[in-house]
Amino acid sequence: KIDACKRGDVTVKPSHVILLGSTVNITCSLKPRQGCFHYSRRNKLILYKFDRRINFHHGHSLNSQVTGLPLGTTLFVCKLACINSDEIQICGAEIFVGVAPEQPQNLSCIQKGEQGTVACTWERGRDTHLYTEYTLQLSGPKNLTWQKQCKDIYCDYLDFGINLTPESPESNFTAKVTAVNSLGSSSSLPSTFTFLDIVRPLPPWDIRIKFQKASVSRCTLYWRDEGLVLLNRLRYRPSNSRLWNMVNVTKAKGRHDLLDLKPFTEYEFQISSKLHLYKGSWSDWSESLRAQTPEEEPTGMLDVWYMKRHIDYSRQQISLFWKNLSVSEARGKILHYQVTLQELTGGKAMTQNITGHTSWTTVIPRTGNWAVAVSAANSKGSSLPTRINIMNLCEAGLLAPRQVSANSEGMDNILVTWQPPRKDPSAVQEYVVEWRELHPGGDTQVPLNWLRSRPYNVSALISENIKSYICYEIRVYALSGDQGGCSSILGNSKHKAPLSGPHINAITEEKGSILISWNSIPVQEQMGCLLHYRIYWKERDSNSQPQLCEIPYRVSQNSHPINSLQPRVTYVLWMTALTAAGESSHGNEREFCLQGKAN
């Protein structure tokens, strides 16, 4: 009931709480002497459902049969209407429409850790729309029954707040949840379990790793666990990997030896625990331990290449280059590289440690047979040295690879192809493809790149350190014992017309012809490999088409003679450069008048 209901009553039959689809009878009756003054026959009782008028009747009472009420709460209010006055509220009632609880499903209980508390969850089924009380009951040994009631409005979880102990780990407990409301009750199917079934251990903690004698092959993982743990599973992986290695261990007692770790690798380790071989559940994984394994001496050998440069009649410059070992080969931080240079006949040797570089340049006599050995060292030792005999890599003409070509292959790749040398192709032990940015000055400081190719290959895709719109000098070496032959070509991965033409810096007269000198186009404006230069000229103030001379591009060339100019005629000259993609805009214009006699 609502309100004070001083003037009358509202009664609801059969009950204020009804099953969905049921009919209710609502009666509103006035108390004695509470009708309209002097006009009791004029009493008009009106029944409202919320704010909507659903029935009225003249007299002291009103009966109304109501059907089709929705789930939830519906408010009915009875009011009295007298002539010439506002409606007066008499009384009201709330009717609660709902359903009996469905049987709770999927009851399951868990205790997190040996010191945790038992908590159970279940599925309530459809909403009853009524106050429904849930009671969780646990029957156990010694004829005891524990229970707890749920105070929440939507209850599908209850924590007993107390702990199951392992004093009789195989004893059976039976859980059941019962839902009760005004329209009925329903109990779940019983769920029977033992301590070992429902206790989910806490994840292991305090994980540590020890490497005996700083060796990766003598590694022990330590951790702490709850007292009853019987099984552990360990998982570990390099920090940069997505795949775990998994190990199951029984009765580990908080330690396990790991035998297959890689040196100088950061690993992530996690551990999980379980109380029984086939009962219960695994704990969550522990927090990760991250640890780096110790170094081991390097394996593998350095890939070494070299370049020789003539200095004068008695000296030559040797530049050695080598590639870093892979992480798995380095097995630690490379502290230095050891380079040993030896004259093979005299036996004189020079050793040097190189740090921070993967190249070394020295000057040696042009006479004698020279060899180098290069190895990489970390804190645990050195790699096996790579030995190379220094020879003239391009001396054997018959070993030179034939028909070398270089073609763009997608973004920032160049496909280099060749034919085996004329001399017995089976003599080739390996090919080396070398490339470096083309610098007109032949700068030896430009980084050198190379890759090795098996003797049966006749192509190589070069992609390392290849930039768009840069021209590369590419060499293919065929190596056979102490001999080598080579061929070279220019190539680029992407090209377009040069951004500018050459800058003419001087025009000089020589025996009736002229010599034009120019500055090279800056490398960053060449936009690929130059194929030709063009020199244009025409008479000043003439509208005729210019004449031109096309010169094949050569790296070192920066002058060219022209002998077809008339004496005492002023000419305008300019130059352009061409790549395979097209011609540049023209460079600066220069005027020149040949002073010599007419032919």
């Epitope: 524990w146 009631q149 007993f160 707040g161």
Partner: nanobody, 125 residues
Framework: QVQLQESGGGSVQAGGSLRLSCAVS????????MGWFRQAPGKEREFVAA???????VYPNSMKGRITISRDNAKNAVYLQLNALKPEDTAVYYC???????????????????WGQGTQVTVSS
């Protein structure tokens, strides 16, 4: 100083009801497990009912449905409602209190640290 004082005992006809009270001073009932035990003449003390600090209750199956333990935190008291009494329910009823957090411990005498003096319940046929 912790004190537990039982009251509400007395003589009652078989089939009758009693409500025993246990008033606690020196400790807060909601922080502890509260138990009721009874001892009949010439017999060992036996477990009747208990309520943990988390409001989980426990009863022996033999008495379930006839007894209810409850707690009033505001009054710092615990109650035991006894219904459908039988002559074999005749005993001294003791209120007890202890920091118990295990299922099995709630029904064990030795887990309770504090005890009242007891109140006599006599059921005649």
């Amino acid at each position: 100083q912790v004190q537990l004082q039982e009251s509400g005992g007395g003589s009652v006809q078989a089939g009758g009801s009693l409500r025993l009270s246990c008033a606690v001073s020196g400790r807060t009932v909601s922080d502890y497990a509260m138990g009721w035990f009874r001892q009949a003449p010439g017999k060992e003390r036996e477990f009747v009912a208990a309520m943990s600090s988390s409001e989980t209750t426990v009863y022996p199956n033999s008495m379930k449905g006839r007894i209810t333990i409850s707690r009033d935190n505001a009054k710092n008291a615990v109650y035991l409602q006894l219904n459908a009494l039988k002559p074999e329910d005749t005993a001294v009823y003791y209120c007890s209190m202890g920091p118990i957090a295990t299922f099995q411990g709630l029904a064990r005498q030795n887990e309770y640290h504090y005890w009242g003096q007891g109140t006599q319940v006599t059921v005649s046929s």
